[in-house]
Interface confidence: medium
């Protein structure tokens, strides 16, 4: 999946299986990514688990779990708030669009989380105070999470190089750059560009991610995934000058 | 399988509160169509679920009983008559510690917010 970190770095990661997205003293977010096509290095998020840890007189521990085709508007115990404590309503789930869009507000840590299902896969976005982001007791283990450190270098895909190659060769794949040797050849570059332009008129990294995803999978739902990811940034990012990201270098983790 | 969600939305839309969709009005047919749409959306995860199959048959029965056409307007899910416990606005007596911004303002300016996102492939 494509990752935008807390420090506004943009990466495309091939991390497969379960990985920690956030792991601090207040909550833990873990994603499970699966290959989008057989033999593909590109992966997308098929499962998401969020654990809100027990916190003072505000909330009991609550677990939220979403999977492909299962985006509940409740925690796994069936509740929609933080439990029986005095401040239980400082944690609340709201269903925005049934089966497609859920928002979780954790007021006790000033945090808003948006989970969506777009096509077959899940998207995740969070707005969180720096103080909470950095509330990590054990930096050696907890500090390794993806939202903070980004993906390990060996798990990154250089999709800009792929983008350049695709531009030069139309629909043909260059084996060295292609993360999906088995991807369908049915999506010409021009069509992918047109589809992405429709939803993402600004040629930023979200637009480039969209083109990459269409060329890699042939699945137009990824256009919406990029579009909604940008919409979530607009809603959640505090710096309106940083909504669109353009230049991207192959970041080192950390 | 989300069939209970479909059921409860239909129950809420037709249960007598807020000028109900009574069973001889266009609103009732609209509520039925919304219900049918909801069951179709959850169909893939409900195979073999008896509650799901009962709902589907029940909808067909009611559609024909009340001469509802399959096409036509659908109703918006209506809010429940009574808010469930713990689903209302944050309790006024909730401790200040449970509201990050309020407690933050006590000893500092506005907190700095950051964003992280994950999407696509």
């Amino acid at each position: 999946p494509h990752l935008r970190t807390f420090t506004d770095r943009f990466q495309t990661c091939k991390v497969q299986g379960a990985w920690p997205l956030i792991d601090n003293n207040y909550l833990n977010v873990q994603v499970t990514n699966t290959p989008v096509l057989p033999g593909s290095a590109a992966t997308a998020t098929s499962k998401l688990t969020i654990i809100f840890k027990n916190f003072q007189e505000c909330v009991d521990q609550k677990v939220y779990q979403a999977e492909m085709d299962e985006l509940p508007a409740a925690f796994v115990d069936g509740s929609k708030n933080g439990g029986d404590k005095h401040g239980a309503n400082s944690l609340k789930i709201t269903e925005k669009v049934s089966g497609q869009h859920v928002e979780i507000q954790a007021k006790y840590i000033g945090t808003t989380i948006v989970v969506r299902q777009v096509g077959r896969y899940l998207t995740f976005a969070v707005r969180m105070p720096e103080e909470v982001v950095n509330a990590v007791e054990d930096w050696d283990s907890q500090g390794l999470y993806l939202c903070l450190r980004g993906c390990p270098l060996n798990q990154q895909i250089d999709f800009q190089a792929f983008h350049t190659n695709a531009e030069g060769t139309g629909a043909r794949r260059l084996a060295a750059a292609s993360p999906a040797p088995t991807a369908p050849e049915t999506f010409p570059y021009e069509t992918a560009v047109a589809k992405c332009k429709e939803k993402l008129p600004v040629e930023d990294l979200y637009y480039q991610a969209c083109v990459f995803d269409l060329l890699t999978t042939g699945d137009v739902n990824f256009t919406l995934a990029a579009y909604y990811a940008l919409e979530d940034v607009k809603m959640l990012h505090s710096n309106k000058d940083k909504l669109h990201l353009y230049e991207r270098t192959r970041d080192l983790p950390g | 399988c989300k069939i209970l969600k479909c059921n409860s939305e239909f129950w809420s839309a037709t249960s007598g509160s807020h000028a109900p969709a009574s069973d001889d009005t266009p609103e009732f047919c609209a509520a039925l169509r919304s219900y049918a749409l909801c069951t179709r959306r959850t169909a893939r995860t409900c195979r073999g679920d008896l509650a799901y199959h009962s709902a589907v048959h029940g909808i067909e029965d009611l559609m024909s009983q009340h001469n509802c056409s399959k096409d036509g307007p659908t109703s918006q899910p209506r809010l429940r008559t009574l808010p469930p416990a713990g689903d209302s606005q944050e309790r006024s007596d909730s401790p200040e510690i449970c509201h990050y911004e309020k407690s933050f303002h006590k000893h500092s300016a506005t907190p700095n917010y950051t964003h992280c996102g994950l999407f696509g492939d």
Epitope: A74 | L4, K5, N7, S8, L32, A51, H57, L82, A85
Partner: antibody, heavy 120, light 109 residues
Framework: EVQLVQSGAEVKKPGASVKVSCKAS????????ISWVRQAPGQGLDWMGW????????NYAQKLQGRVTMTTDTSTSTAYMELSSLRSEDTAVYYC?????????????WGQGTLVTVSS | QSALTQPRSVSGSPGQSVTISCTGT?????????VSWYQQHPGKAPKLMLY???KRPSGVPDRFSGSKSGNTASLTISGLQAEDEADYYC?????????FGGGTKVTVL
């Protein structure tokens, strides 16, 4: 076989709270609502409210609003009904019942009942 | 909260028919597709007999039938049998008007 098994009888003092459990088996717990109904000695049935184990949504009888809390634990397929600030008129048999499938709201499977006695 | 009114008791000889009425308002009965009926023997949990006014769950004998006219729903037991002696309750799910009738004792003479 679809079954609802309730917790045992309780004796409580006025002002206390009681929490009755109802364990479901033989069906998909999250596909049906759970209603709670009570019956005072020699009296009729009194609907208390219902909960959706799928979403956590609840709808309580107006007269009990603020005193009753219905919850579910999907991991154990158990529904709970807690009634607080008990008074002598809350002495009753409390039943949980499965809300039937499909569009119609009815209670098709019932627990055996839990007698709650409120007495000083 | 409006009431659902049932007769306190009805009786009949074996083989006869008896009808129990349940009268409410337009919102609680007249417009509702949610009227159901329950049978309760002494010391036992209630048992669903009819739902959606007329529908019979599997296992319920076909001598139990239901109907609705205006704001009154009715349960009819034709060919009354000894085991039909019990209390019968109507029920309507109607948002804020969700409630049971007061109950009717059916006596088999």
């Amino acid at each position: 076989e679809v079954q609802l098994v309730q917790s045992g009888a309780e004796v409580k003092k006025p002002g206390a709270s009681v929490k009755v459990s109802c364990k479901a088996s033989g069906y998909t717990f999250t596909s049906h609502g759970i209603s709670w109904v009570r019956q005072a000695p020699g009296q009729g049935l009194d609907w208390m409210g219902w909960i959706s184990p799928y979403s956590g949504n609840t709808n309580y009888a107006q007269k009990l609003q603020g005193r009753v809390t219905m919850t579910t634990d999907t991991s154990t397929s158990t529904a709970y009904m807690e009634l607080s600030s008990l008074r002598s008129e809350d002495t009753a048999v409390y039943y949980c019942a499965r809300v039937g499938s499909g569009p119609y709201y009815y209670m098709d499977v019932w627990g055996q009942g839990t007698l709650v006695t409120v007495s000083s | 909260q409006s009431a659902l009114t049932q007769p306190r008791s009805v009786s009949g000889s074996p083989g006869q028919s008896v009808t129990i009425s349940c009268t409410g308002t337009s919102s609680s009965v007249g417009d509702s597709i949610y009227v159901s009926w329950y049978q309760q023997h002494p010391g036992k949990a209630p048992k669903l007999m009819l739902y959606d006014v007329t529908k019979r769950p599997s296992g319920v004998p076909d001598r139990f039938s239901g109907s609705k006219s205006g704001n009154t729903a009715s349960l009819t037991i034709s060919g009354l049998q000894a085991e039909d002696e019990a209390d019968y309750y109507c029920f309507s799910y109607a948002g804020t008007d969700t409630l049971f009738g007061g109950g009717t004792k059916v006596t088999v003479l």
